[in-house]
């Protein structure tokens, strides 16, 4: 697959037979981090 470059690590991991569940966990934790980062940026 091909998301943006920031998702390359997720995409490359598919070669290693990663499960949908583990990919989802990675994606959701990235989303949580992104929201937290924007929150911190907004509070400056």
């Amino acid at each position: 697959g091909g998301g943006g470059s920031k998702h390359k690590c997720v995409q490359n991991s598919l070669v290693n037979n990663e499960t949908l569940e583990s990919i989802m966990n990675t994606l959701e934790s990235e989303e949580d981090f992104r929201k937290y980062f924007y929150y911190l940026e907004g509070s400056k």
Partner: antibody, heavy 121, light 107 residues
Framework: EVQLVESGPGLVKSSETLSLKCTVS??????????WGWIRQPPGKGLEWIGS???????FYNPSLKSRVTISVDTSKSQFSLRLTSVTAADTSVYFC?????????????WGQGTTVTVSS | DIQMTQSPSSVSASVGDRVTITCRSS??????LVWYQQKPGKAPKVLIY???RLQSGVPSRFSGSGSGTDFTLTISSLQPEDFATYYC?????????FGGGTKVEIK
């Protein structure tokens, strides 16, 4: 109750690009824990997964179609889209959009009604 | 890719019969297995997820079992509305793959 509706042209010329949209209502496409996918079914045949996208924009494609497929998401419109380039008669199918997530062990628990796409020469 | 092999491809049965459909995966998929029912002109609908969990609203005559590579869908007493095509799907890893389908026909 989440509902999905596919839209797009029913007829596409050979070698051109097929474009479909799936509109999500009754729930948010930004909900956590879901992939949003496209599946197709040629006349009288079985189901074939085309690809899926996460709300973040990360995409996952069927290797057999990967060079021709693009799936994108527009969370502001509650839509995700399919583009399939260089179509041939073999791409004539009913195209379904669907949701698959943690709640149902990543089975497709919500489907669109399906839209028939015919590739003409 | 994980190959899903479903058998039989079709079965003729009568109302009240017990029907068993099997699905075998080419790799261990734990219990990441889903069964769908599809009627002509309609989208598939989930019957069983997680190999053995019955979807809400699905009659209890449907049951699923198995883990690893071998899975079974059983209809304990076939009803007129059960004549349809059934598909298994592995949801362990991308690319998602489906079995070839089993058409349950009236004998």
């Amino acid at each position: 109750e989440v509902q999905l509706v596919e839209s797009g042209p029913g007829l596409v010329k050979s070698s051109e690009t097929l474009s479909l949209k799936c509109t999500v209502s009754g729930g948010s496409i930004s909900s956590s824990g879901y992939y949003w996918g496209w599946i197709r079914q040629p006349p009288g045949k079985g189901l074939e997964w085309i690809g899926s996208i996460h709300r973040s924009g990360s995409t996952f494609y069927n290797p057999s179609l990967k060079s021709r497929v693009t799936i994108s998401v527009d969370t502001s419109k509650s839509q995700f889209s399919l583009r399939l380039t260089s179509v041939t008669a073999a791409d004539t199918s009913v195209y379904f959009c669907g949701r698959h997530g943690r709640d149902y062990y990543y089975g497709m628990d919500v489907w669109g009604q399906g839209t028939t796409v015919t590739v003409s020469s | 890719d994980i190959q899903m092999t479903q058998s039989p491809s079709s079965v003729s049965a009568s109302v009240g019969d017990r029907v068993t459909i099997t699905c075998r995966s080419s790799q261990d998929i734990n219990n990441w297995l889903v069964w769908y029912q599809q009627k002509p002109g309609k989208a598939p609908k989930v019957l069983i997820y997680g190999a053995s969990r019955l979807q809400s609203g699905v009659p209890s005559r449907f049951s699923g079992s198995g883990s690893g590579t071998d899975f079974t869908l059983t209809i304990s007493s076939l009803q007129p509305e059960d004549f349809a095509t059934y598909y298994c799907q592995q949801a362990n890893s991308f690319p998602l793959t489906f079995g070839g389908g089993t058409k349950v026909e009236i004998k």
